[in-house]
């Protein structure tokens, strides 16, 4: 194939719920991805695998299968949701996320995503990693790109 470009756009929404007894935070994070097919033929996106890390610990994973077919010289925007759980050794975060005295409870999460396309039995994988701010204290919808966290660890595209 000539090339398939994958661009992680950002967090679209984050919906939060809590388990008071277990001091656990549940975050359903919906992300947006742009996949561009620069070939002169259609390409099949076989699967998208994603995981979310908080403080170097994987807190959520997701996999979407048989996603879509992208036409030549075309782009498709795909949303995918990763259910995450902040619990156990990270239960100290429960206090921060439920603290009433602060308005925004932003935490920094690392979003990893891998897009797999299959070409006559040969798989091609394209991966992206991005750090993003997510509010763990309330349900939030974001303007695309609004949640981006820029630091020296995150290479600029």
């Amino acid at each position: 194939p000539r090339s398939i470009d994958v661009k992680y756009i950002g967090v679209k929404s984050a919906y939060v719920s809590y388990d008071v007894q277990k001091r656990t935070i549940y975050l359903n994070i919906t992300n947006t991805l742009n996949i561009t097919n620069n070939n002169y033929y259609s390409v099949e996106v076989e699967n998208i695998t994603a995981q979310v890390q908080f403080s170097k610990t994987v807190i959520g994973k997701a996999r979407l299968n048989n996603i879509t077919i992208i036409g030549p010289l075309d782009m498709k925007q795909i949303d995918y949701t990763v259910p995450t759980v902040i619990a156990e050794e990270m239960s100290y975060m429960y206090d921060f996320c439920t603290l009433i005295s602060i308005k925004v409870h932003n935490i920094v999460l690392m979003m990893q995503v891998t897009v797999t396309t299959t070409y006559f039995g040969h798989s091609e994988q394209i991966s992206q990693e991005r750090y993003q701010y997510v509010d763990c204290g309330r349900n939030t919808t974001y303007q695309l790109g609004q949640s981006e966290y820029l630091n020296v660890l995150q290479p600029q595209q």
Epitope: Y41, V43, P72, F120
Partner: antibody, heavy 122, light 107 residues
């Protein structure tokens, strides 16, 4: 039947621009690519670029970047090629060509327009 | 860019004769090759796609084949309307590139 009807011959002054049209009929315009090819008098064929009329996505031969601009109007099933800053080197016949494709397969240039002659002269 | 070297550039032959035109690719193009025919009035039509598949409506006297990086168009028995120009086209990579053409003339 599939037809690609191109606009008529053009006589253009150097330094100006021209827009060549290619009206498609007999098939679903957005289900195929449209490519453009140049042929100078008595010479061979040269690929300019390609457009997906459905998405508007384009790709150009490096040689024609900045020279050619490809567009398409879905409502009229018409593809356009604009050539700018014309010189005598741009005097040629320009063809629009339909290309079919599938998933991981391409069968390009199955139907050709009749060609549009562009002459650049002062 | 992939170079397509087409030979001969011109060929004189007689009616009923069998002729072959060749294109050599500078890089591997698999079976991604077309043969095109151009009439004196400029009209172009595709004869063969994917190296050896005949387009609908094209006479069976035309055939395409491959041997390594050499691609051939063969006309088994020349008819009067075959004395025109022929081009090969590779579409394995961008930019698409054409052979220099073969002018088929009547002897």
């Amino acid at each position: 039947q599939v037809q690609l009807q191109q606009s008529g011959a053009e006589l253009i002054r150097p330094g100006t621009s021209v827009k060549v049209s290619c009206k498609a009929s007999g098939y679903a315009f957005t289900d195929y690519l449209i490519e453009w090819v140049k042929q100078r008098p008595g010479q061979g064929l040269e690929w300019i670029g390609v457009i997906n009329p459905g998405s508007g996505g384009t790709n150009y031969n490096e040689k024609f970047k900045g020279k050619a601009k490809l567009t398409a109007d879905k409502s009229s099933s018409t593809a356009y090629m604009q050539l700018s800053s014309l010189t005598s080197e741009d005097s040629a016949v320009y063809f629009c060509v339909r290309s079919s494709y599938g998933v991981y397969v391409a069968y390009p240039m199955d139907y050709w327009g009749q060609g549009t002659s562009v002459t650049v002269s002062s | 860019d992939i170079q397509m070297t087409q030979s001969p550039s011109s060929l004189s032959a007689s009616l009923g004769e069998r002729v072959s035109l060749t294109c050599r690719a500078s890089q591997d193009i698999g079976s991604n090759l077309n043969w095109l025919q151009q009439e004196p009035d400029g009209t172009i039509k595709r004869l063969i796609y994917a190296t050896s598949s005949l387009d609908s409506g094209v006479p069976k006297r035309f055939s395409g084949s491959r041997s390594g990086s050499d691609y051939s168009l063969t006309i088994s028995s020349l008819e009067s309307e075959d004395f025109v120009d022929y081009y090969c086209l590779q579409y394995a990579s961008s930019p698409r590139t054409f052979g220099g053409g073969t002018k088929l003339e009547i002897k």
